[in-house]
């Protein structure tokens, strides 16, 4: 018996087609992805093959103005339209709190939403009961397939699930649910979840009875053969893990942003054992036409977005200096504003010992593309912020050793004075440079804001200590020459859309007046 698994993950609000780098589509003939194009391909496969499941491994939420405006209603609407069979909860599904998950998505989705390792307690338990499930058994042709869900147990540090959801260890939580499916004589079981490729592989190895793992969170690109676009494969598709009980378990992910549709064909014997698995992600490029009915629906929903982008979010009573002349040479108040917003967006009081789990931000000055003039009645709009942060990136959470941070700050000024983009703006950090010293030895003082303290203060950076830092995904991926961050980071969790972070902060503060306050100094 043959099953075709179509899968997406980390779509992050890319409902419309995008450029090759998943930013806003500029030249339509070269654009990719989007739900209208995805639907065309899915329907084509559904017509051609008998047993097809369309699955999503979480993080539909967060990433573009679509989510900012529609807050998840767009996810439910278009996933329903595409007739998804199941979805696992990702960490970003909790970005607007539990209510922001329940109302727009859990109550509106016409497909099961899954996670076996999230347990509700207190008053939330009855409110959310039945709205998400540990697993679902789906009839496919004349057979049944069990789908069991899981979500990163780091979600409380990455999003806003509140205090009434407990995120358990994935493997511990999955095993009894898979065992339950076995008692129901379900002998074909897919683990669908959002904990990253390393955990996906562990689940394949450790959870008895799981036949296939469909993952997300780490934006992992797997491919067999010559890859069709810019993404470099982390391994073959599917990635085969040998389980502790000796089975070959295929593990897949499909990069991110709806650029690819994962396509996996699995052959099962009559006892539900995987005999063979093969496939590849399908690049959703312009050779695949956009479905006209879905496209028309997208255009209808778009109208509200255009209106939103010109509405006032808040006011500034000072000039927001985002000029290259400032942000690539010295501390600029636009950099301070953005870093303050980044830290504010990551306030998670999850431990009495810590006032917060992260206190530091770094931001490449070259990523700040425009100032905002306060003389336009002080008004700040989404449109203004899109000029400041036009690349559609995310502000991510990483863990780095102090020694890596020191290298990053040396890189920040290694060729100072040439208006290059790697000059770092900061938050929760005090840095002093001596430009008379040779490159690689110009950081003379680097103090960082403590987190394990009741009164935050600045202490010297310790080389061997592990620190959490918020930074643009561009830097986490080694951009602007920050190869040391990419090579040495100990953990990387994708965060929220950059503009969304800043716009939320401005809306919250209502009136802003960021200053230049001595975060970056030259001796």
């Amino acid at each position: 018996w043959e099953l075709t698994i179509l899968h997406t993950n980390d779509v992050h609000s890319r409902l419309e087609q995008t450029s090759e780098d998943s930013s806003k589509c500029v030249n339509a003939s070269r654009c990719m992805g989007g739900v209208a194009r995805l639907f065309t391909k899915v329907q084509q496969i559904r017509r051609a093959e008998p047993n097809v499941l369309l699955l999503d491994a979480g993080d539909q939420y967060q990433g573009t103005i679509w989510f900012t405006v529609y807050k998840g209603a767009e996810v439910a609407h278009f996933m329903n339209a595409l007739r998804y069979d199941a979805m696992a909860l990702g960490n970003h599904e909790f970005d607007n709190g539990v209510e922001g998950l329940i109302e727009p998505l859990l109550k509106e989705a016409k497909f099961p939403i899954l996670s076996a390792n999230i347990k509700a307690k207190g008053p939330l338990a009855s409110q959310i009961s039945g709205l998400y499930l540990p697993y679902k058994v789906l009839p496919v042709g004349d057979e049944v397939v069990g789908i069991v869900g899981y979500t990163s147990k780091e979600t409380p540090f990455l999003s806003n699930p509140g205090t009434n959801l407990v995120f358990e260890d994935e493997i511990t939580a999955l095993q009894p649910e898979v065992d339950k499916l076995k008692t129901l004589n379900v002998n074909k079981i897919i683990a669908l979840g959002h904990s990253g490729f390393e955990m996906d592989k562990l689940i394949a190895q450790k959870v008895r009875g799981v036949d296939v793992v469909v993952g997300g969170h780490s934006n992992t690109f797997l491919y067999t053969g010559n890859p069709p676009s810019k993404e470099v494969p982390a391994g073959k598709y599917p990635f085969i893990v040998t389980s502790d009980d000796g089975r070959k378990v295929p593990v897949v992910q499909a990069y991110a942003f709806g650029k690819y549709l994962g396509y996996l064909k699995i052959e099962f014997d009559e006892r539900g054992n995987v005999i063979s698995s093969h496939g590849n992600p399908i690049l959703l490029n312009s050779s695949i036409p956009e479905d006209p009915s879905i496209k028309a629906d997208i255009n209808k929903w778009r109208i509200k977005l255009d209106n939103y982008s010109t509405q006032e979010l808040g006011k500034t009573i000072v000039y927001l200096d985002g000029s290259s002349q400032s942000c690539r040479f010295r501390e600029c108040n636009m950099g301070n504003l953005i870093c303050d917003a980044m830290i504010n967006n990551n306030l998670r009081h999850t431990d009495e010992m810590f006032w917060n789990h992260v206190s530091m931000c770094i931001l490449n000055g070259g990523g700040i593309r425009s100032p905002i003039d306060e003389r336009n009645n002080g008004t700040i709009t989404w449109e203004n912020l899109a000029a400041v942060l036009p690349f559609g990136g995310t502000f991510d959470l990483v863990q780095l050793k102090g020694s890596t941070l020191k290298k990053a700050f040396e890189h920040s000024v290694h060729r100072y004075g040439q208006s290059t983009g790697e000059f770092l703006q900061v938050g929760g950090i005090h840095v002093v440079y001596d430009l008379s010293r040779k490159p690689g030895d110009r950081v003379v003082k680097l103090d960082v804001l403590c987190t394990k303290c009741r009164v935050p203060s600045y202490d010297p950076l310790k080389m061997d200590e592990v620190y959490k830092v918020i930074l643009p995904n561009f830097l986490a991926n080694g951009g602007d020459g920050f190869q040391m961050i990419k090579d040495e980071l100990l953990r990387h969790d994708s965060g929220d859309q950059d503009i969304n972070v800043v716009s939320t902060y401005i809306s919250k503060m209502k009136v802003i007046y960021p200053a230049v306050e001595g975060r970056i100094k030259f001796s």
Epitope: A125, S126, S129, G130, L133, Y135, K136, V137, P139, D142, E143, V144, G146, P176, E177, K180, L181, T183, L184, N185, V186
Partner: antibody, heavy 119, light 107 residues
Framework: QVQLVQSGAEVKKPGASVKVSCKAS????????MHWVRQAPGQGLEWMGA????????SYAQKFQGRVTMTRDTSTSTVYMELSSLRSEDTAVYYC????????????WGQGTLVTVSS | DIQMTQSPSSLSASVGDRVTITCKAS??????LAWYQQKPGKAPKLLLS???SLETGVPSRFSGSGSGTDYTLTISSLQPEDFATYYC?????????FGGGTKVEIK
């Protein structure tokens, strides 16, 4: 709306067989399990087994293994439960009840069929 | 098989009383517990599933709680139409098993 309509009461002699039917309407017949639960006079509820009409898969309670047969006819959206080698302690009301494949609580029940086993 | 022990087997109460029925499983059932109400000559009616999930149309005076092996059905203010027999059922492990029932009678 969902309805489960069962066949009428039966009186059988010990050693005989009985076949009870349950006709479903108001939902997609092939995507839910149909369970059989019986209740002896003045007693509690006892699960006998279930059939998944989508593929005909059956699970029986050990106690009834070998004596009970469950079948389905998808063209008429009907399931059947046949119990053989009847004895007096099989006198009971037999209910069909719908349940999810994966979460087997019973959200809709038939009206019940009284089977009396008496010589 | 998982044994479901329900207590009490019967109770007398008055209209307006708060009534609690307990159900103990012989092993953990991971919150896969349902409660049913049955009136004489009628089929059982599902009240709650997943311990706490109230079925559509079931009055909010019915509520469920518990975890692990111990579960409770509570009727906050007994109404005349609530006099019936109540059954718990586990659906964690085949064979699905029911408690022995609790008959709620008028005092």
């Amino acid at each position: 709306q969902v309805q489960l309509v069962q066949s009428g009461a039966e009186v059988k002699k010990p050693g005989a067989s009985v076949k009870v039917s349950c006709k479903a309407s108001g939902y997609t017949f092939t995507t839910y399990n149909m369970h059989w639960v019986r209740q002896a006079p003045g007693q509690g509820l006892e699960w006998m087994g279930a059939i998944f009409p989508g593929n005909g898969h059956i699970s029986y309670a050990q106690k009834f293994q070998g004596r009970v047969t469950m079948t389905r006819d998808t063209s008429t959206s009907t399931v059947y439960m046949e119990l053989s080698s009847l004895r007096s302690e099989d006198t009971a009301v037999y209910y069909c009840a719908r349940g999810d494949y994966d979460e087997s609580y019973f959200d809709y029940w038939g009206q019940g069929t009284l089977v009396t086993v008496s010589s | 098989d998982i044994q479901m022990t329900q207590s009490p087997s019967s109770l007398s109460a008055s209209v307006g009383d708060r009534v609690t029925i307990t159900c103990k499983a012989s092993e953990g059932i991971y919150n896969r517990l349902a409660w049913y109400q049955q009136k004489p000559g009628k089929a059982p009616k599902l009240l709650l599933s997943g311990v706490i999930s109230l079925e559509t149309g079931v009055p909010s005076r019915f509520s469920g709680s518990g975890s692990g092996t111990d579960y409770t059905l509570t009727i906050s203010s007994l109404q005349p139409e609530d006099f019936a027999t109540y059954y718990c059922q586990q659906y964690w492990s085949i064979p699905w098993t029911f408690g022995g029932g609790t008959k709620v009678e008028i005092k």
